[in-house]
């Protein structure tokens, strides 16, 4: 007997004193447990368990299903076991047909034998098909046959336990192996939109899509910096054997400003974790913010083109846009488009194309936009730069020579005297009087300047030049002088 110290409890003894026993079908199973502190017998096979509080376990007519492990336990919790095979030629295998294997792990095909003395206990493919070449297995008459290191390729494999009984091959019922894939990558997570902008009271709903090899992937919506459990709804699909998709939809039926923040969809499996975020911004009412893309004061040369461009943020969507000049609305020459095709885009662009501008087309051009909540506008002051035009050049009765020029920016008038027949007038003459005639008129028209000189200062034949100029260009007008004796002849102005 194993050495046991005095007073130290020892395990019960079972009779017959065998580790394993064969009983013929129909015969009696009689097992005796000897122990002063006997508590119970238990029987286990596959998922079945039975108990017996008598110290002698008796099964009068043994059946194949009485095959299994019989354990006697004493009051100290010590136990001894005997495994009984009930040999039944008509039922060689006990079978639990559920067969699940985790990828890369071993799995047990549960087909324990009722007769351990049969030979060639092994696995066979269904309908004579061979097993995968790399499939390795280890038979154990009491437990079944262990498939080593299950591969994903074994999924849906049909197989039988097999043994040779009296020279004949006997097959068990068929098993279909279902492989639970191992996680070899983190889940793939994506979100329906990266950001949401809502008005108070509107519904917030966002969907996270989680993709993985099996449904045992864990996922949840979390609010950053908050432990509050969020309400989610799930839909899921298996697209083929190892392609699982779950949609986790988070909904806030009536969003409030303080619901604004970052929401994270988190998923993990045994390999690792992944997350994706979406940002919710809840505003108490809609808004429009306009950003000019060029300076709102525009200077353009006569006959040239200019584009007035604005970008604007509008939430909710803009409903009406228009460009206005002098209380007139443009029906063409402008375009309005979203800054991006992104579903959550709130930024738009509007462009007014002004072509071959005339000096008379300067003024205030206004862009107006509105949505269901607000209106907004922006004005561009357009100034058309024009080359000076000499409107009048006259000799007045008082002997003054007067030159009136119009242009933008405000022209400057200079006077020059050219003696004799010289073409180049270089000697400048200071004007007696200079006035801006329409300084208090409309702000965007041409500016008119009048300049006068005293012709009595000229003593010789020659030409007087009135030159009007600004940043755009210059224009001149000329007065010819001819003296006969002491009298000045008529002055002939020409340009």
């Amino acid at each position: 007997q194993p050495s046991v110290s005095p007073g130290e409890p020892s395990p019960p003894s079972i009779h017959p004193a065998k580790s394993e026993l064969i009983v013929r079908v129909g015969n009696e199973i009689r097992l005796l447990c000897i122990d002063p502190g006997f508590v119970k017998w238990t029987f286990e096979i596959l998922d079945e368990t039975n108990e017996n509080k008598q110290n002698e376990w008796i099964t009068e007519k043994a059946e194949a299903t009485n095959t299994g492990k019989y354990t006697c336990t004493n009051k100290h919790g010590l136990s001894s076991s005997i495994y009984v095979f009930v040999r039944d030629p008509a039922k060689l295998f006990l079978v639990d047909r559920s067969l699940y294997g985790k990828e890369d792990n071993d799995t047990l095909v549960r087909c324990p034998l009722t007769d351990p003395e049969v030979t060639s206990y092994s696995l066979k493919g269904c309908q004579g098909k061979p097993l995968p070449k790399d499939l390795r297995f280890v038979p154990d008459p009491k437990a079944g046959i262990t498939i080593k290191s299950v591969k994903r390729a074994y999924h849906r494999l049909c197989l039988h336990c097999s043994a040779d009984q009296e020279g004949k091959s006997v097959l068990s019922d068929k098993f279909i192996l279902k492989v639970r894939p191992a996680f070899k990558a983190v889940p793939v997570v994506s979100v329906s939109k990266a950001s949401y902008l809502l008005r108070e009271g509107e519904e917030f709903t966002v969907t996270c899509t989680i993709k993985d090899v099996s449904s045992s992937v864990y996922s949840t919506w979390k609010r950053e910096n908050s432990q509050t459990k969020l309400q989610e709804k799930y839909n899921s699909w298996h697209h083929g054997d190892f392609n699982y998709e779950r949609q986790a939809t988070l909904t806030i039926s009536s969003a409030r400003v303080n619901d604004s923040g970052v929401f994270m969809c988190y998923a993990n499996n045994t390999f690792g974790s992944a997350n994706v975020t979406t940002t919710l911004e809840v505003v108490d009412k809609g808004f429009i913010n306009i950003f000019p893309m060029i300076n709102t004061t525009v200077f353009v040369n006569d006959g040239e083109n200019v584009d007035l461009i604005v970008e604007y943020e509008a939430f909710p969507k803009p409903e009406h846009q228009q460009w206005i000049y002098m209380n007139r609305t443009f029906t063409d020459k402008w375009e309005d488009y979203p800054k991006s095709e992104n579903e959550s885009n709130i930024r738009y662009v509007s462009e007014l194309h002004l072509t071959r501008l005339k000096g008379t087309e300067g003024g205030t051009y206004t862009f107006l936009v509105s949505n269901s909540d607000v209106n907004a506008s922006i004005a561009f002051n357009v100034y058309v730069n024009t080359k000076p035009e000499i409107l009048t050049y006259d000799r007045l009765v008082n002997g003054m020579l007067q030159c009136v020029a119009a242009g933008f920016p405000e022209p400057t008038i200079d006077w020059y005297f050219c003696p004799g027949t010289e073409q180049r007038c270089s000697a400048s003459v200071l004007p007696v009087d200079v006035q801006t005639l329409n300084a208090s008129g409309p702000p965007f028209g041409k500016l008119v300047v009048q300049s006068s000189i005293d012709s009595s200062a000229f003593k010789h034949n020659g030409t007087v030049e009135c030159k009007a100029y600004n940043d755009v260009g210059k224009t001149s007008a000329y007065f010819n002088f001819a003296f006969k004796g002491n009298n000045k002849e008529q002055i002939h102005p020409h340009t």
């Epitope: 194993p2 009779h15 017959p16 026993l21 064969i22």
Partner: antibody, heavy 121, light 107 residues
Framework: EVQLVESGGGLVQPGRSLRLSCTAS????????MNWVRQAPGKGLEWVGR??????????EYAASVKGRFTISRDDSKNSLYLQMNSLKTEDTAVYYC????????????WGRGTLVTVSS | DIQMTQSPSSLSASVGDRVTITCRAS??????LNWYQQKPGKAPKLLIY???SLQSGVPSRFSGSGSGTDFTLTISSLQPEDFATYYC?????????FGGGTKVEIK
């Protein structure tokens, strides 16, 4: 060939000791529980004792008539079974058989030819 | 200890006879009963195990029956080589006791 061969028998005086050996061949000795059975001259068979294999934790059981005097042991690496007999008595005179149990039943399906132990002064 | 009582202790029979030997246990031993045959100067030989299972290589004229306390060994047609002593043995609880034996002699 599957067989058991006993050795170590002979004449021994009462009170003395003797060690019998049984050597197995042709089968996996370590799989089996093993027994000693004796037969006094002209008498019936008497079970002496047994030793379990590793699965049975090498536990031993003895007939009341030899308990405390005889010890059964085994050495699986040598395919050998032993019977150490101390304080021998004249009534221990017998042919001693080594017997194998099959894996799944308690019976003696293979016997040695026996070795005679004579205890006499 | 479980006592095993065999009867008869001896019997005389002729070749071809049907021979029955009985064995009774002092308490129920279920089917834990074995039968052996021993010829003079030889080691015993297993004939029947588990009350009724014929050991491999044993002629089918030997059969066993019984359960609980009463068991029978039957030789359906005695052959010359069957003259020997027959022992029953219980294998339920140690000590694994043998019956006293039944000697089958030629009439």
């Amino acid at each position: 060939e599957v067989q058991l061969v006993e050795s170590g028998g002979g004449l021994v005086q009462p009170g003395r000791s003797l060690r019998l050996s049984c050597t197995a061949s042709g089968f996996t000795f370590s799989d089996h529980d093993m027994n000693w059975v004796r037969q006094a001259p002209g008498k019936g068979l008497e079970w002496v004792g047994r030793t379990r294999n590793a699965a049975g934790s090498y536990t031993t059981e003895y007939a009341a008539s030899v308990k405390g005097r005889f010890t059964i042991s085994r050495d699986d690496s040598k395919n050998s079974l032993y019977l150490q007999m101390n304080s021998l008595k004249t009534e221990d005179t017998a042919v001693y058989y080594c017997a194998r149990e099959p894996k799944y039943w308690i019976d003696f399906d293979l016997w040695g030819r026996g070795t005679l132990v004579t205890v006499s002064s | 200890d479980i006592q095993m009582t065999q009867s008869p202790s001896s019997l005389s029979a002729s070749v071809g006879d049907r021979v029955t030997i009985t064995c009774r246990a002092s308490q129920s031993i279920s089917s834990y009963l074995n039968w052996y045959q021993q010829k003079p100067g030889k080691a015993p030989k297993l004939l029947i195990y588990a009350a009724s299972s014929l050991q491999s290589g044993v002629p089918s004229r030997f059969s066993g029956s019984g359960s609980g306390t009463d068991f029978t060994l039957t030789i359906s047609s005695l052959q010359p080589e069957d003259f020997a002593t027959y022992y029953c043995q219980q294998s339920y609880i140690a000590p694994y006791t043998f019956g006293g034996g039944t000697k089958v002699e030629i009439k």
